[in-house]
Amino acid sequence: GSMGHAPKVGRLIYTAGGYFRQSLSYLEAYNPSDGTWLDLADLQVPRSGLAGCVVGGLLYAVGGRNNSPDGNTDSSALDCYNPMTNQWSPCAPMSVPRNRIGVGVIDGHIYAVGGSHGCIHHNSVERYEPERDEWHLVAPMLTRRIGVGVAVLNRLLYAVGGFDGTNRLNSAECYYPERNEWRMITAMNTIRSGAGVCVLHNCIYAAGGYDGQDQLNSVERYDVETETWTFVAPMKHRRSALGITVHQGRIYVLGGYDGHTFLDSVECYDPDTDTWSEVTRMTSGRSGVGVAVTME
């Protein structure tokens, strides 16, 4: 990636890291308004299976692992990217390494959910306070989950699907910060590990993933009012270990693995028409990226 100053533009979709033959250090940003990609400052350490989020206009890369020819190291790292300076800086590490982690943000705090360290599949969850640069453990999930999808809706944290070390999961659970407790919610219709999970229009969407046999292109959404999961239109490509985010009322899914190929495809879902369309391609195929959108 280039080390010059990033152009000052509006909302961009950032994709960090990922995997193709080895863990990647790329940081790239897609501008949906003009369809262009920016090549930005590389991560200081390559990583895949990471998660991305934005707090206070800064992009955070959380967890993952560095799978390289020199070895395979799970990451406890938290790194912060400033779009104004196009530079990464390290923050306090998590209490444990977390590969294939999920993250969510509530009230400016980052929640790191599940993930794995070697053969250990975590149910533990920890919260980062950017102003103090500190992590603190909160209540553990009811289920061990790696490849977990995480989303925040109405200041509640949802952990969806994943893999507990023995089984891929269709179960989901919800964390109540005020009570510091987790409760199970209605299970998805489909077992999904490595799905893309996000929130759009008061619903939680779960896209793609892997059911223990095959990659999926199906998509379902959870209505918190009715507590039910309903299928919507499927993606054009089957994909697991995909990146996902929401930009201007549409869902974007980036890359992933289809069982044969590392996808460069980026698809966009329009909830008004219940359709997916191919909108761009990443500069190269990859799985296990961290994705987030800059704030206005």
């Epitope: 995997y19 070895g71 395979n72 490849g147 023995t166 223990g212 095959d214 270990a241």
Partner: antibody
């Protein structure tokens, strides 16, 4: 019945290449990670490589990283080990094995092995 | 990489004997240890997984145990078909590593 059958071994000169195949039946390789393990003549077992069916990520022993490539073709239910820049110390019987999640964290089915001899 | 140090490298025993083989991990591997049996010219066969769980179809005279980073395979009463080489394997983290093997021979 679960079965794994390796093929593609043989005699190759140092610096040469071989592609091993592991044909699976009785289960879908899309449902398990596949591993390659080798055994030099009169020696013990050495883990070589694996491929994860969910993420596509591959792992390699340091001794083969950069020279060997593991892959899978789910439509043929077959895994492969592409071996380049072969050395005398790569001479071994190569086994493919299925990684079981239940049994947890172990290789529950193995092929019969295929012999690779690297010699001039 | 995690080393698995297996001992003894060989042992002689008689039918009916109780046989114990040990593996020591160079660092914590939790219970992510398996034991395999291999006979000459054949592929290894899984005996024990998760340190102490008996794999389906394996005779109950085989058992595994863990004490910290020490792992033990015990054959309570050696049978003629048990003369073979035994390997431990850790899969706590990759690269996965095997012990050097223990050859169980007829006394």
């Amino acid at each position: 019945e679960v079965q794994l059958v390796e093929s593609g071994g043989g005699l190759v000169q140092p610096g040469g290449s071989l592609r091993l195949s592991c044909a699976a039946s009785g289960f879908a390789i899309s449902a398990s990670s596949i591993h390659w393990v080798r055994q030099a003549p009169g020696k013990g077992l050495e883990w070589v490589a694996s491929i994860d069916p969910e993420t596509g990520e591959t792992l390699y022993a340091k001794s083969v990283a950069g020279r060997f490539t593991i892959s899978a073709d789910t439509s043929k239910n077959t895994a492969y080990l592409q071996m380049n820049s072969l050395r005398a110390e790569d001479t071994a019987v190569y086994y493919c094995a299925r990684w079981g999640y239940e049994p947890y964290m172990a290789m529950d089915y193995w092929g019969q092995g295929t012999l690779v001899t690297v010699s001039s | 990489d995690i080393q698995m140090t297996q001992s003894p490298s060989s042992l002689s025993a008689s039918v009916g004997d109780r046989v114990t083989i040990t593996c020591r991990a160079s660092q914590s591997v939790s219970s992510a240890v398996a034991w395999y049996q291999q006979k000459p010219g054949k592929a290894p066969k899984l005996l024990i997984y998760s340190a102490s769980s008996l794999y389906s179809g394996v005779p109950s005279r085989f058992s595994g145990s863990r004490s910290g980073t020490d792992f033990t395979l015990t054959i309570s009463s050696l049978q003629p078909e048990d003369f073979a080489t035994y390997y431990c394997q850790q899969s706590y983290s990759f690269p996965s590593t095997f012990g050097q093997g223990t050859k169980v021979e007829i006394k």
